[in-house]
Interface confidence: low
């Protein structure tokens, strides 16, 4: 808490400019009007304030806006954002994607902080769903963002947003998350032709049910072993040898190298030896 002191004569700030970097903390508190600061927040980032000085400026804004800052101020917080606590951010109502981008830019290159996580949560809740533009922005800053969401949170992702998802964005997703994302992807890509569809849906197939895999096996997709190994075991088990052969196409020979790993191991154990022998790979059920 900065002690309340009168502003020395001639030091009252008329605008937010570089002369303020020479002000002591108590002078900033006494001589900078909070309303002036709020209207000229965009200038703060151009001035090399110390972190101690930024603490004072934050304090002034907190006094002016005890219920939470307006978006006009939030958008121009810049490095002052790093001073905010999750509790501060929970008071905000952020609706502009430009505001979100500006604040994420401040944190760029760092791990997702609790402040950023809270900001994103407030933003997405305010929008009601995780739309394509938001998802584009978030995955650009944090490639693992999508997989940090719970299945329930992923439920609010509309199928149209799936177009923004890149394969690397799904790298850390677990099966429960893919279970939610896969049907959305299927809807999103439903109008694509067979080969294009497979390219797009491939990253999501860890959430595919058995019958969708059966259907894919009829479409000459030649799934690679890396994708096959990420499929749900319960979805793979009911597939026949013929269906797996069609699904993998020329990649079927890779089953031998993976015969001790799930889901290949469990699938092999479900098959008749006579059927496995038709593959000519020496797989033992």
């Amino acid at each position: 808490e900065v002690e309340k002191t009168a502003c020395p004569s001639g030091k009252k700030a008329r605008e937010i400019d570089e002369s303020l970097i020479f002000y002591k903390k108590w002078e900033l508190e006494a001589c900078v009007d909070a309303a002036l600061l709020a209207t000229q927040m965009d200038r703060v980032n151009a001035i090399p304030f110390t972190y101690e000085q930024l603490d004072v400026l934050k304090h002034k804004l907190d006094e002016l806006y005890p219920q939470g800052y307006p978006e006009s101020v939030i958008q121009h917080l810049g490095y002052l954002f790093l001073k905010m606590s999750p509790e501060d951010i929970r008071k905000w109502n952020v609706t502009s994607l430009e505001t979100l981008k500006a604040l994420l830019e401040v944190n760029k290159g760092h791990e997702m902080s609790p402040q950023v996580a809270t900001l994103i949560d407030r933003f997405v809740k305010g929008r009601g769903q995780l739309d394509k533009d938001t998802l584009d922005t978030l995955t650009a800053f944090y490639p693992g963002y999508l997989c940090s969401l719970s299945p329930e949170e992923l439920s609010s992702v509309p199928p149209s947003s799936i177009w923004a998802v890149r394969p690397q964005d799904l790298d850390t997703c677990d099966p429960r998350q893919l279970d939610v994302l896969y049907p959305k992807a299927r809807l999103a890509f439903q109008n694509m032709n067979g080969s294009e569809y497979f390219v797009k849906i491939q990253s999501f197939l860890g959430g595919a049910p058995t019958e969708d895999l059966k259907a894919l096996s009829q479409q000459n997709v030649s799934m690679d072993l890396a994708t096959f190994m990420k499929l749900r075991t319960d979805a793979v088990l009911p597939l026949t040898v013929a269906e797996v052969q069609k699904l993998l196409g020329p990649h079927v020979e890779g089953l031998k190298a993976e015969e001790r790993h799930r889901p290949v191991r469990d699938w092999i154990l479900r098959q008749r030896q006579d059927d496995l022998d038709t593959l000519g790979l020496g797989l033992q059920g």
């Epitope: 329930e152 509309p158 049907p183 439903q190 049910p209």
Partner: antibody, heavy 119, light 107 residues
Framework: EVQLLESGGGLVQPGGSLRLSCAAS????????MTWVRQAPGKGLEWVSG????????YYADTVKGRFTISRDNSKNTLYLQMNSLRAEDTAVYYC????????????WGQGTLVTVSS | DIQMTQSPSSLSASVGDRVTITCRSS??????LAWYQQKPEKAPQSLIY???SLQSGVPSRFSGSGSGTDFTLTISNLQPEDFATYYC?????????FGGGTKVEIK
């Protein structure tokens, strides 16, 4: 054994409201998307509305959009259909159904509940 | 919306006959098609999903085929309990849509 039991149907005047319920047993309700399908007397099947496992995503036929609301309470294993501004053409047997392994196919259906909209 | 057209709308057949019902979609739906059987005053029952996969517990005399826009349900050895109305349904995209139904009656 999977069982879906609809209730809440009855006679209602045009413009009125009804809330249908579908109590599910014999399945892990929270793991399945659910749907409502209706059948007007002597007519074919018409899909009405669907809902995701968490309730976060809902889908509606154009004929009911803005008037009907689908919801679910996973703690009670129950699916709901709130029907407002009912019209004569909403008269039908309403079935709730559980999605099968495929996203939009349905492997178990309730016995249906009749909704009659008439003055 | 995707329109589903079934034919014929009704047919008469005898026990032991081979019966074929066709379903055509107004645009390509891949293999995202299901078939249901409905008896009078009863709820529909699932027969086939993914165009050709037999639902658990359904007799093997029922089979499905097709992909894209043209699909077929075949009952190879019609039994007394098979006299009912059959519906196809696409689940390629929302809104989900059903065919108008085919009523299979005793000749």
């Amino acid at each position: 054994e999977v069982q879906l039991l609809e209730s809440g149907g009855g006679l209602v005047q045009p413009g009125g409201s009804l809330r249908l319920s579908c109590a599910a047993s014999g399945l892990t309700f929270r793991s399945y998307a659910m749907t409502w399908v209706r059948q007007a007397p002597g007519k074919g099947l018409e899909w009405v509305s669907g809902i995701s496992v968490s309730g976060g995503i809902t889908y509606y036929a154009d004929t009911v959009k803005g008037r009907f609301t689908i919801s679910r309470d996973n703690s009670k294993n129950t699916l709901y259909l709130q029907m407002n501004s009912l019209r004569a053409e909403d008269t039908a047997v309403y079935y709730c159904a559980k999605r099968g392994a495929a996203v939009g196919s349905f492997d178990y259906w309730g016995q249906g509940t009749l909704v009659t909209v008439s003055s | 919306d995707i329109q589903m057209t079934q034919s014929p709308s009704s047919l008469s057949a005898s026990v032991g006959d081979r019966v074929t019902i066709t379903c055509r979609s107004s645009q390509g739906i891949g293999s995202w098609l299901a078939w249901y059987q409905q008896k009078p005053e009863k709820a529909p029952q699932s027969l086939i999903y993914a165009a050709s996969s037999l639902q658990s517990g359904v007799p093997s005399r029922f089979s499905g085929s097709g992909s894209g826009t043209d699909f077929t349900l075949t009952i190879s050895n019609l039994q007394p309990e098979d006299f009912a109305t059959y519906y196809c349904q696409q689940y390629n995209s929302y809104p989900l849509t059903f065919g108008g139904g085919t009523k299979v009656e005793i000749k």
